[in-house]
């Protein structure tokens, strides 16, 4: 039985869609296309007679169409206009002929997307960020991807708009990353590029390490300490250091040489992070004694947390 | 107190390459980052990169990356800013500035600055 | 990379007047601003960071105010020493960019 299949079925506008014929009877000696589901001469795009492998152009010819010697019909530079049936009429010897319809179906070129977004920089636990893939087309399914994966389950994304907005609620320090829409229809897909979210967050209560040179578990008279503190922060935070409610200096490490029971008292890191608005700090009581028997860094830390 | 204090002026060759010397004191030389900051004639500052003592890592300008070079000598408490295939528009006054703090600070003490002069 | 612009690019003022500089930067800074001050032959002196923090040193008729991406240095009452270059920079992160400059001269 003849056929018609349509390569491909789904065409993008401007693309080339090929209409083949499958089960062409043995005696044939021409063959007419024509728009839509019947014979009719108002709808002739082209007629070809095998014999002299000639085509003739019909009233409904555009310009676009080519017709093959297997009775295969191309049709180039697709417009939605060609959405529809396909008739072919093979004529036979015998004057008995067929007809097979196909049909396509074109879709609008998509545009590149991009994405517009309220807020690139969010502050952790407090902003939520909305981004919007932008244009809007009618018939296409929109999809997103973080890191280049297809988007994580959580209650705090939520997909509106006909998944146009993707918001996230009450952003965390983990959801900062590469975000892309990507636009399909049954034709074709097109992703945006790249937008960037830099969530900051911070500054974590910090931590302070102690490094004894020469290393010992104990604070002895006539060692340098050296107090690293730490804090998770983004923006990395602003260091400073108070001994004994005394400001000192604005670095990471506090370093004292050949400390002596002078020296004794609380160690205050603060951090500072002005983009968050956050502060956080830690206090260790540090003794020194002149003996071994030295009790060291005192472990119960206090944590003081402003916002 | 802190002092930072620089080579000498230098009168080069375009084409040529200058190697300035910050000589750090009066702190812990392996706790603040050095800066390498340039003002050309009757301009403005403009910032070349910075190096941690502490580990050698360095961060630079995107307009001087593949022509400049920083490092240090732990030992003399020195850091070294090196300007390579000068041009006549790197003539300027070279300053080492140390960074307040660590992290996010501005620059709080400056070098006495460098002459370099490029010139055929 | 963040754009510094300062203005006005140069002022003359008399002794006791309020002076004004402003800088805009291109990017929100969060408030990681600082002011220098560089008088004739001299190098740059740091005067205030983190927008308005003061500089142990630094008297106090010079003030800081701003915030996101606009900035102001004040001097409230200009006196003679005060005759220099005032630079904005942005501390937040490398590279570390400054404004072109506002020179400052007495009437």
């Known amino acids: 039985k003849l056929t018609i299949e349509s390569t491909p079925f789904n065409v993008a506008e401007g693309k080339e869609v090929l209409l083949l014929a499958h089960n062409l009877p043995q005696n044939r000696i021409g063959y007419s296309w024509y728009k839509g589901e019947r014979v009719d001469g108002n709808s002739l795009i082209v007629g070809y007679v095998i014999g002299t492998q000639q085509a003739t152009p019909g009233p409904a010819y555009s310009g676009r169409e080519t017709i093959y010697p297997n009775a295969s019909l191309l049709i180039q530079n697709v417009t939605q206009n060609d959405t529809g049936f396909y008739t072919l009429q093979v004529i036979k010897s015998d004057l008995v002929n067929e007809e097979a319809t196909g049909q396509f179906h074109v879709y609008p070129e998509l545009p590149k997307p991009s994405i517009s977004s309220n807020n690139s920089n969010p502050v952790e636990d407090k902003d939520a960020v909305a981004f919007t893939c932008e244009p809007e087309v009618q018939n296409t399914t929109y999809l997103w991807w973080v890191n280049g994966q297809s988007l994580p389950v959580s209650p705090r994304l939520q997909l509106s708009n006909g998944n146009m907005t993707l918001t996230l609620l009450s952003v965390k320090r983990n959801d900062a990353g590469s975000y892309e829409c990507e636009i399909q229809n049954p034709a074709s897909a097109n992703r945006s590029d790249p937008v960037t979210l830099n969530v900051l967050y911070g500054p974590d209560v910090p931590t302070i390490s102690p490094i004894i040179s020469p290393p010992d578990s104990s604070y002895l008279s006539g060692a340098n300490l050296n107090l690293s503190c730490h804090s998770a922060s983004n923006p990395s935070p602003q260091y400073s250091w108070r001994i004994n409610g005394i400001p000192q200096q604005h670095t990471q490490v506090l370093f004292i040489a050949k400390i002596t029971p002078n020296n004794n008292g609380t160690y205050a890191c603060f951090v500072s992070n002005l983009a968050t608005g956050r502060n956080n700090s830690i206090v260790k009581s540090i003794t020194v004694s002149a003996s071994g028997t030295s009790p060291g860094l005192s472990a119960g830390a206090h944590h003081h947390h402003h916002h | 107190q802190v002092q930072l204090v620089q080579s000498g002026a230098e009168v080069k060759k375009p084409g040529a390459s200058v190697k300035v010397s910050c000589k750090a004191s009066?702190?812990?030389?392996?706790?603040?980052?050095l800066h390498w900051v340039r003002q050309a004639p009757g301009q403005g500052l403009e910032w070349i990169g910075y190096?941690?003592?502490?580990?050698?890592?360095?961060s630079y300008a995107q307009k001087f990356q593949g022509r400049v070079t920083m490092t240090r000598d732990t030992s003399t408490s020195t850091v070294y800013m090196e300007l390579s295939s000068l041009r006549s528009e790197d003539t300027a006054v070279y300053y080492c500035?140390?960074?307040?703090?660590?992290?996010?600070?501005?620059?709080?003490?400056w070098g006495q600055g460098t002459l370099v002069t490029v010139s055929s | 990379d963040i754009q510094m612009t300062q203005s006005p690019s140069s002022l003359s003022a008399s002794v006791g007047d309020r002076v004004t500089i402003t800088c805009r930067a291109s990017?929100?800074?969060?408030?990681?601003l600082a002011w220098y001050q560089q008088k004739p032959g001299k190098v740059p002196k740091l005067l205030i960071y983190n927008t308005k923090n003061l500089v142990e040193g630094v008297p106090s008729r010079f003030s800081g105010s701003g915030s996101g991406t606009d900035f102001t240095l004040t001097i409230s009452s200009l006196q003679p020493e005060d005759v220099a270059t005032y630079y904005c920079?942005?501390?937040?992160?490398?590279?570390?960019?400054f404004g072109q400059g506002t020179k400052v001269e007495i009437k």
């Open positions: 990017e929100n800074q969060y408030g990681y």
């Open positions: 009066g702190y812990i030389f392996t706790s603040y980052w």
């Open positions: 500035a140390r960074e307040y703090g660590n992290y996010n600070y501005p620059l709080d003490y």
């Open positions: 190096i941690n003592p502490q580990t050698g890592y360095t």
């Open positions: 920079q942005h501390h937040l992160g490398t590279p570390y960019t």
